[in-house]
């Protein structure tokens, strides 16, 4: 069986945000029927990556890749093996470890978020970058922005493109 | 079981190359005892990412994340489930789909490499970027450079840090 990638629209949105490319972000958000407030929230996160420069995008891309290819995520596939192999399919859901990281990025404290990142990538430069991004997001985003970002994530996770 | 990430040193090297950061690359290469010719080969690949600009780094990061989190890679974990679960461990090897992509990047034709990327990310802008990088690498690297890059990859895959 040629197995589909895991929730491609999530990674499209993540990389559009981290890249700082508004045109790519808008194109991705269009595909999940994002609202104007949801877009505003994502733009605020994107601003943090842009302000923090290239190194921020690369290091956070490294974190995302590391978590996505981690054995925590591999493990998710393993848990459902018996049922999945009977059906000869594997679900396309986003890995819970990735979901958890994104949730903490929005709703956790800086310490909680950095601690989660450290489980996967303990390089000091990576953790410092994670803290800078988290502090920036907390400074830029209102509670309403964060709720809008979470509602957009729900749309992404439940999208047919996921 | 808290499962370790898959071959972290590989992703450290990949992101250092794609980022264009020589200091990060040297730091990673030191950890796998890279020789001078192996380092030279990696620098040539790094030059291609730098010349092709930010969008190249981001798009190739997206490809790497997509393959690493694809169900082809998840599937690798699943194949060995019975044995692995008995031992309550999962191997830390790099996913064969990632390995295959890197091998084709070095030794395949541009068409073969782009075809492999297209299985995971068919966005035209991604495939165009993959072709540009591949053509650049073929133009910059001698056969000897490519052999050195492959020998470095063997060191990475067999490293205790993988």
């Amino acid at each position: 069986v040629k197995m589909a990638e895991t929730c491609p629209i999530f990674y499209d949105v993540f990389f559009a945000v981290a890249n700082g490319n508004e045109l790519l972000l808008d194109l991705s958000l269009t595909k999940v029927n994002a609202t104007e407030p949801e877009r505003t929230a994502m733009k605020k996160i994107q601003d943090c990556y842009v302000e923090n420069g290239l190194i921020s995008r690369v290091l956070d891309g490294l974190v995302m890749t590391t978590i996505s290819s981690s054995k925590d995520c591999m493990g998710e596939a393993v848990q459902n093996t018996v049922e999945d192999l009977k059906l000869n399919t594997l679900g396309r859901e986003i890995c819970p470890a990735v979901k958890r990281g994104v949730d903490l990025f929005l709703t956790g404290t800086p310490d909680e978020y950095v601690e989660q990142v450290a489980q996967y990538k303990a390089l000091p430069v990576v953790l410092e970058n994670a803290r800078i991004l988290k502090n920036c997001v907390d400074a830029k985003m209102t509670e309403e922005d964060k709720e809008n970002a979470l509602s957009l994530l729900d749309k992404i996770y439940t999208s047919p493109l996921c | 079981v808290k499962m370790a990430e898959t071959c972290p040193i590989f992703y450290d090297v990949f992101f250092a190359v794609a980022n264009g950061n020589e200091l990060l690359l040297d730091l990673s290469l030191t950890k796998v005892n890279a020789t001078e010719p192996e380092r030279t080969a990696m620098k040539k690949i790094q030059d291609c990412y730098v010349e092709n600009g930010l969008i190249s780094r981001v798009l190739d990061g997206l490809v790497m994340t997509t393959i690493s989190s694809s169900k082809d890679c998840m599937g690798e974990a699943v194949q060995n489930t019975v044995e692995d679960l008995k031992l309550n461990t999962l191997g830390r090897e790099i996913c064969p789909a990632v390995k295959r992509g890197v091998d084709l990047f070095l030794t395949g034709t541009p068409d073969e490499y782009v075809e492999q990327v297209a299985q995971y990310k068919a966005l035209p802008v991604v495939l165009e970027n993959a072709r540009i990088l591949k053509n650049c690498v073929d133009a910059k690297m001698t056969e000897e450079d490519k052999e050195n890059a492959l020998s470095l990859l063997d060191k990475i895959y067999t490293s205790p840090l993988c």
């Epitope: 490319n21 045109l23 808008d26 | -």
Partner: antibody
Framework: EVQLVESGGGLAQPGGSLRLSCAAS????????MTWVRQAPGKGLDWVSA????????FSADSVKGRFTISRDNSKNTLYLQMDSLRAEDTALYYC?????????????WGQGTLVTVSS | DIQLTQSPSFLSASVGDRVTITCWAS??????LAWYQQKPGKAPKLLIY???TLQSGVPSRFSGSGSGTEFTLTISSLQPEDFATYYC?????????FGPGTKVDIK
């Protein structure tokens, strides 16, 4: 009433440069992404380049990448296309167009175009 | 890049005729397709976006359908002002590409 007026076209030598401008009025310019589209004489439409509402992000067709640069000045409600290393095949009528909105980037308003001729 | 092809490339019709133009995409583009009309010496005009949504001010005799790789533009009853060239455009991914056009002229 939305209006887009292009200027800056003319005759250029191969390898030469031109800078096109597009003056926008009748809408809140800094809320919309903008695009350049060209049309060679007697031919079809060819998308050239797009720029986001803030001007932070751009995308260009491979045929012009590294030679043409799209930019905007939101304080002047003006879109630009800097064309360098011009080639004969760049000869065309160049239109600027407004994106309908961020979540469906069709081009709902177009200028009347400015003609660029590249010839020695 | 995503390639678009249009059929027919040239079409002769009479006032009152029902006209159908087809656009094919080289890969699936969901409903991210638009149709434009262009008259000689004029800028293109947006007719339909999202494959089937009529742009405001466009007469209801124009309609669009399709999804994925095959799309159609239909003019239910051709009027004298409809003689023009029609282009499809994909907006699924950059670079945005146009079809080669279909010229509709008077039989």
């Amino acid at each position: 009433e939305v209006q887009l007026v292009e200027s800056g076209g003319g005759l250029a030598q191969p390898g030469g440069s031109l800078r096109l401008s597009c003056a926008a009025s009748g809408f809140t310019f800094n809320n919309y992404a903008m695009t350049w589209v060209r049309q060679a004489p007697g031919k079809g439409l060819d998308w050239v380049s797009a720029i986001s509402d803030s001007g932070r992000s751009t995308f260009s067709a491979d045929s012009v990448k590294g030679r043409f640069t799209i930019s905007r000045d939101n304080s002047k409600n003006t879109l630009y296309l800097q064309m360098d290393s011009l080639r004969a095949e760049d000869t065309a009528l160049y239109y600027c167009a407004k994106h309908r909105n961020w979540n469906y980037p069709v081009f709902d308003y177009w200028g009347q175009g400015t003609l660029v001729t590249v010839s020695s | 890049d995503i390639q678009l092809t249009q059929s027919p490339s040239f079409l002769s019709a009479s006032v009152g005729d029902r006209v159908t133009i087809t656009c094919w995409a080289s890969q699936g583009i969901s409903s991210y397709l638009a149709w434009y009309q262009q008259k000689p010496g004029k800028a293109p005009k947006l007719l339909i976006y999202s494959a089937s949504t009529l742009q405001s001010g466009v007469p209801s005799r124009f309609s669009g359908s399709g999804s994925g790789t095959e799309f159609t533009l239909t003019i239910s009853s051709l009027q004298p002002e409809d003689f023009a060239t029609y282009y499809c455009q994909q907006l699924n991914s950059y670079p945005f590409t146009f079809g080669p056009g279909t010229k509709v002229d008077i039989k």
